[in-house]
Interface confidence: low
């Protein structure tokens, strides 16, 4: 049982109240984290509560404001970035969201030494991406899909690319599918460590089919949004990588980095770029059939002014059991010799672990091992490697930070976080200063989150950065639900689940059950994290039991579970939710006539299929922005797990796994279907097709659309959405309003 913040004595129990839906919608019980913006080994910046930008020196204990809130306010800045030479700050305003990571903004450069904004040769607007060089104060930015370079903020810009064109050619920024499904960033350019070179990607979307949808707005006629969006099996973007010498950009111009021959022989993706030194770069490539990844280390040839990627420096990662990597192919962390590196990939037992690659992948030295997974390599120094894993006490939904001494032999391993605040903190991430001199630990739960600062040599805690005292006080009179994280063993499969129980839970009584599902490949829902959210309210106030189950296809428990869904999406994820429900019924406290399931996105797909499974287990359910057919979703994501929708590949399962194919089976359940009409990710088309199939089958259902809302259903739509879903569930479970 996961412990929550301490309860008051029973005598005071009558002063405690349940959570309300309003609490959730107002974000009353949201928590804060503290991530230092490191600028050296011992200094970091932080935006204070009153919006001053403050520099902290850990060793001297001093702090001073480098940029006042007055300056920030003068341009309505919502973000900032200090140049590495500390002479300038860019200020970001007029933030305008595009897709998940991308946004445009207006940028102003403030000269700290002169205390004024840099004028003349100002930046165009809106800018799609802007960043400082890692050394000095060069600026690279993307405007109207082209890349520009400034040697100094006040200098005129040098235009690096000229072929950028909206929805056609993207330079230095990803197109939709690369942003969402491959890079997970708003940028596609990378400075070399000392700023000598700038690498960038060019994406050619000329031949990609376009998704078009109406944006209703306030005008007489709706706008049409057009996005080059490759659905499964469609033509993909063509990617090229270039590198330009930023010292003499006009000298030879951008030089293309060659693609490995084994990759270039068929459709492929670029997956990431990692600079090793100023004259060595590492590129990762992936075949369109995403079970072969090639890591290519390339060197600058001074004599030819070109980049050479010898075959001897190509490292191949191939999966025989699924796709390459986890959600993404992992990226390398290079060691100080600038050729060997550390990387997470599957070991022979099918668990993702850290390996040290010196010459070939085949000769990789395994650094971690066991029936658990290494999840992230945070930092490699001369003598230590810091990483996170879910090893401790065999709970896959935990994250602890470990240090391996790589300077000594044999290497010794130490868990930095396992025993710090054992009950409160079981799920950590970390942020390291230069050379890992200091680091911040951010604990996400299961107790109230806390952020702390530590010495990188001794691991000693220096100070608490954020402990959420106000939140702790606010929760003192709240009857929070109880949470359990346990596992079911079914047919050699371990199903971890989180159960959220009403505050006065009594095992001898019967409760309605709501399954919350995501279930997408390489996801994890059962995590030891703190949350006060909608399902907390449903348990606290409405007396429901809520369960989250990680079935086949979910992450961090080995390849057998992860790759079980390969080429068969929509089968085992659903089976495992159903299996878990049956086990929950056997526990004796579930009212089997009042069971519901709900999910969003992939979870909407799974919940729909579960409702249409014909088991009779579910009385009702909700699908928010569901995928309804894998033929409608993005190529990069879908094909990773499903292969191609062609007859000689996997078309049959693409057809068999649609929600529409099961329309008849919705007849005996209450179904609420919800979607935003401006969903750029899971297109409204998905729900439109479900609705059409249900109408054609003459099956009654409920639906709600959110006009001009995307996949996140944010703002006022959020309030409406959760209110609407609450009413639906209360009606389904015969709970009085």
């Amino acid at each position: 049982i996961v412990l929550r913040p301490s309860r008051v004595h029973n005598s005071e129990e009558n002063t405690m109240r349940a959570l309300t839906l309003k609490d959730i919608l107002n974000g009353t019980f949201s928590y804060k984290t503290f991530f230092p913006n490191w600028i050296s080994g011992q200094e970091y910046l932080h935006q204070s509560a009153d919006n001053n930008i403050v520099l902290y020196n850990i060793e001297t204990g001093q702090s001073y404001t480098i940029l006042s809130n007055r300056t920030m306010k003068s341009v309505n800045a919502s973000n900032y970035g200090l140049s590495p030479d500390r002479q300038f700050v860019y200020l970001e305003s007029d933030y305008s969201k595009l897709w998940r990571y991308s946004y445009t903004a207006t940028y102003y450069i403030y000269d700290l030494s002169n205390g004024e904004f840099v004028r003349g040769n100002e930046l165009p607007r809106p800018i799609q991406y802007l960043c400082w060089s890692p050394v000095g104060s060069k600026l690279a930015y993307v405007y109207q899909n082209n890349i520009y370079l400034k040697q100094r903020p006040g200098d005129p810009p040098f235009q690096i690319t000229f072929n950028g064109r909206e929805n056609k050619i993207f330079n230095g920024i990803p197109d939709w599918v690369y942003e969402e499904e491959m890079l997970a960033t708003k940028y596609a350019l990378w400075w070399s460590p000392n700023g000598k070179f700038l690498a960038y990607a060019e994406f050619n979307d000329t031949d990609i089919p376009v998704i078009a949808y109406s944006y209703y707005g306030d005008e007489q006629y709706p706008r049409t949004i057009n996005i080059p969006y490759p659905k499964a099996g469609a033509k993909n973007p063509v990617v090229r990588i270039f590198i330009i010498d930023t010292t003499y950009p006009a000298y030879v111009g951008p030089q293309e980095v060659p693609v490995p021959a084994m990759i270039a022989s068929s459709d492929y993706y670029f997956s990431w770029l990692t600079w090793v030194t100023d004259e060595r770069v590492c590129l990762q490539w992936l075949k369109r059939v995403q079970n072969v990844s090639v890591l290519s280390i390339c060197d600058f040839r001074e004599d030819w002014q070109t980049w050479d990627c010898p075959k001897t420096q190509e490292h191949i990662e191939e999966s025989r059991t699924g796709w390459a990597g986890g959600f993404f192919v992992s990226t390398p962390v290079f060691s100080y010799d600038a050729i060997s590196y550390y990387k997470i990939f599957s070991d022979k037992d099918g668990y993702k672990h850290i390996h040290y690659i010196k010459d070939t992948v085949e000769n990789a030295i395994q650094i971690t091992s066991g029936k658990w997974e290494a999840i992230n390599i945070f930092r490699v120094t001369q003598d230590s490697l810091f990483y996170s894993s879910n090893e401790f006490e065999e709970y896959p939904g935990r994250r602890n930070i470990y240090r391996i001494s790589i300077g000594s032999y044999p290497p010794s391993k130490k868990c930095v976080t396992c025993h710090l605040r054992k009950e409160r903190c079981q799920y950590y991430t970390a942020s390291f200063s230069d050379y890992a001199k200091y680091y911040a630990l951010v604990c996400y739960g299961p107790g109230i989150p806390i952020s702390t600062l530590h010495d990188g040599r001794t691991d000693q805690e220096i100070k608490i950065l954020e402990e959420n005292k106000e939140l702790e006080n606010a929760l003192k009179n709240i009857q929070l639900p109880k949470e359990e994280i346990k596992k079911l063993e079914v047919d050699e499969i371990t199903l971890w689940y989180k159960m959220i129980l009403p505050p006065q839970f009594d095992r001898s009584k019967k409760y309605p059950l709501l399954i919350q599902v995501y279930g997408g490949p390489c996801s994890q829902s059962v995590r030891s994290v703190f949350a006060v959210n909608w399902i907390s309210y449903l348990a606290s106030k409405e007396g429901m039991v809520i369960a989250l189950v990680d079935g086949r296809g979910t992450a961090f428990q080995g390849d057998k579970l992860l790759y079980a869904v390969y080429r068969k999406l929509g089968v085992y994820e659903v089976e495992d939710q159903i299996t878990a429900v049956r086990k929950f019924i056997e526990m004796g406290f579930i009212d089997e006539k009042r069971i519901a399931i709900w999910g969003w996105s992939y979870g909407g797909y799974v919940s729909s299929l579960a409702l249409a499974s014909g088991t009779g287990l579910f009385k009702c359910g909700i699908a928010v922005a569901p995928v309804s057919s894998w033929e409608y979703y993005a190529s990069v994501y879908t094909e990773r797990f499903m292969g191609l929708p062609t007859k000689d590949d996997n078309l049959e399962h693409y057809k068999n796994s649609t929600v529409m194919a099961r329309a008849e089976y919705f007849r005996n359940v209450d179904y609420l279907l919800i979607h935003g009409t401006a969903d750029d990710n899971v297109h409204f088309q998905n729900s439109a097709q479900i609705a059409k199939a249900l109408v054609n089958a003459q099956v009654d259902f409920q639906a709600m659309w959110y006009s001009d809302q995307n996949h996140g259903l944010s703002g006022l739509s959020t309030n409406h959405l959760y209110t609407h879903m609450t009413h639906f569930l209360k009606q389904c479970f015969s709970l009085s309003d």
Epitope: M262, R320, T321, G350
Partner: antibody, heavy 122, light 107 residues
Framework: EVQLLESGGGLVQPGGSLRLSCAAS????????MSWVRQAPGKCLEWVSF????????YYADSVKGRFTISRDNSKNTLYLQMNSLRAEDTAVYYC???????????????WGQGTTVTVSS | DIQMTQSPSSLSASVGDRVTITCRAS??????LNWYQQKPGKAPKLLIY???TLQSGVPSRFSGSGSGTDFTLTISSLQPEDFATYYC?????????FGCGTKVEIK
């Protein structure tokens, strides 16, 4: 008809070299991984080496590592096994075999040649 | 390396008999197991891959089962053409080790 035809076997002295070839026909050679498997007289099967369809991913059994080299020429639809520093224990029938389609999950050898005999003896 | 142990090493059976051959891996190989049939002087033939998937063209009297370390090949009704040596092979990690075979002889 799918066919694999090995050649290049024969009698060789210990320490000598041989190059085996396997000519493939009836399928798209460049889209399949290929293996060499051997069987000493009256003994079990022993997997020797594997090469991926593009020729860049290669595995060897420990017993031959450093002495044998697998390669392929997709333009000639031919698989090779260069065998150096041969030993008496390398005496066997050598089969070339085709891997299951690369779109599948499993490794397995679905088509085999008739084998070529290598005898290492002084 | 993973070791593969087959049992029995030989067996005698009559036409129409149900025959079961077992194969044990020294560590879990999940379902990464293949079964081959070899007749004297001939190349092996793939019967089953992935522990239980019948290779196309193989008669349905052959079936495979098992997962982890223990696997079984079953011939539901032995036919005259089934007298041969049967090999298991792990396909989980290189070197893809074979078992040493089970010879099925006429009783």
């Amino acid at each position: 008809e799918v066919q694999l035809l090995e050649s290049g076997g024969g009698l060789v002295q210990p320490g000598g070299s041989l190059r085996l070839s396997c000519a493939a026909s009836g399928f798209t050679f460049s889209s399949r991984g290929m293996s060499w498997v051997r069987q000493a007289p009256g003994k079990c099967l022993e997997w020797v080496s594997f090469i991926s369809s593009s020729g860049t991913y290669v595995y060897y059994a420990d017993s031959v590592k450093g002495r044998f080299t697998i390669s392929r020429d997709n333009s000639k639809n031919t698989l090779y096994l260069q065998m150096n520093s041969l030993r008496a224990e390398d005496t066997a029938v050598y089969y070339c075999a085709r891997d299951l389609p690369r779109t599948g999950v499993y490794f397995g050898m679905d088509v085999w040649g008739q084998g070529t005999t290598v005898t290492v003896s002084s | 390396d993973i070791q593969m142990t087959q049992s029995p090493s030989s067996l005698s059976a009559s036409v129409g008999d149900r025959v079961t051959i077992t194969c044990r891996a020294s560590q879990s190989i999940f379902n990464y197991l293949n079964w081959y049939q070899q007749k004297p002087g001939k190349a092996p033939k793939l019967l089953i891959y992935g522990a239980s998937t019948l290779q196309s063209g193989v008669p349905s009297r052959f079936s495979g089962s098992g997962s982890g370390t223990d696997f079984t090949l079953t011939i539901s009704s032995l036919q005259p053409e089934d007298f041969a040596t049967y090999y298991c092979q792990e396909s989980y990690s290189t070197p893809y080790t074979f078992g040493c075979g089970t010879k099925v002889e006429i009783k």
